[in-house]
């Protein structure tokens, strides 16, 4: 764990990016599944 003020904001940014990446993967998977089912 870091109490660095630069690292603190960067860690939050990294988490946001990871969530976005995960959501994009999940939503992308769902979309492909829908297309496949049609």
């Amino acid at each position: 764990h870091s109490d660095g003020i630069f690292t603190d904001s960067y860690s939050r940014y990294r988490k946001q990016m990871a969530v976005k990446k995960y959501l994009a993967a999940v939503l992308g998977k769902r979309y492909k599944q829908r297309v496949k089912n049609k």
Epitope: H1, S2, D3, G4, I5, F6, T7, D8, S9, Y10, Y13, R14
Partner: antibody, heavy 114, light 110 residues
Framework: SVEESGGRLVTPGTPLTLTCTVS????????MIWVRQAPGKGLEWIGI?????DTYYASWAKGRFTISKTSTTVYLKIASPTTEDTATYFC????????????WGQGTLVTVSS | DVVMTQTPASVSEPVGGTVTIKCQAS??????LLWYQQKPGQPPKLLIY???TLASGVSSRFKGSGSGTEFTLTISDLECADAATYYC????????????FGGGTEVVVK
């Protein structure tokens, strides 16, 4: 503590790597920055290396400088120095919100001249 | 990159006086601003972080204020030891904005 070394007189175009040796804290917990100061001029931010090794640079520094690190050392490589790169180069640890301070080295002087 | 513009470049005030230094960011950086003091031949010393929070061991005569794009460093009850150059530095979203310094303000104490 933070201590820079490797500054010397080099001819234009000769690659140079500066070293920043740290002790008393972990590079896996803090970001480190490189800053330079030309003689009689202001401070100029070069770039940062985060705890996880990610690096970011000032727009003007991209392609000219490379920051890297090991467990106790941070490096700044100047790819092809020009006379405009003559300056004192400082390495510093980011400020802490609980420690409420940062750590700077005394700097190392790089002179680029033919 | 965010550009930091500092004014004035130099200021001269008597002992006991007050100095005000301004720093303007080219875009909104919220409260992500540092103030440093640098004396000749020395590395910078952190005075203030998060625009207004005093760093450890720094005199309460130093006061930082502002947010967004306009920031101020005020030094009151000037002492001879305050003669130095002062710099602001942005640290908002360094990964996209960089962490530029202002051009510096030389404070001369008469």
């Amino acid at each position: 503590s933070v201590e820079e070394s490797g500054g010397r007189l080099v001819t234009p175009g000769t690659p140079l790597t500066l070293t920043c040796t740290v002790s008393g804290f972990s590079l896996s917990s803090y970001a480190m920055i490189w800053v330079r100061q030309a003689p009689g001029k202001g401070l100029e931010w070069i770039g940062i290396i985060y705890d996880n090794g990610d690096t970011y640079y000032a727009s003007w520094a991209k392609g000219r400088f490379t920051i890297s690190k090991t467990s106790t050392t941070v490096y700044l490589k100047i790819a092809s120095p020009t006379t405009e790169d003559t300056a004192t180069y400082f390495c510093a640890r980011e400020p802490g919100s609980t420690t409420q301070n940062d750590l700077w080295g005394q700097g190392t002087l790089v002179t680029v001249s033919s | 990159d965010v550009v930091m513009t500092q004014t004035p470049a130099s200021v001269s005030e008597p002992v006991g006086g007050t100095v005000t230094i301004k720093c303007q960011a080219s875009e909104n950086i919220y409260n992500s601003l540092l103030w440093y003091q640098q004396k000749p031949g020395q590395p910078p010393k952190l005075l203030i972080y998060r625009a207004s929070t005093l760093a450890s061991g720094v005199s309460s005569r130093f006061k930082g204020s502002g947010s967004g794009t306009e920031f101020t460093l005020t030094i009151s009850d000037l002492e001879c030891a305050d003669a130095a150059t002062y710099y602001c530095q942005n640290y908002y979203n360094i990964w996209t904005n960089g962490a530029a310094f202002g051009g510096g303000t030389e404070v001369v104490v008469k």
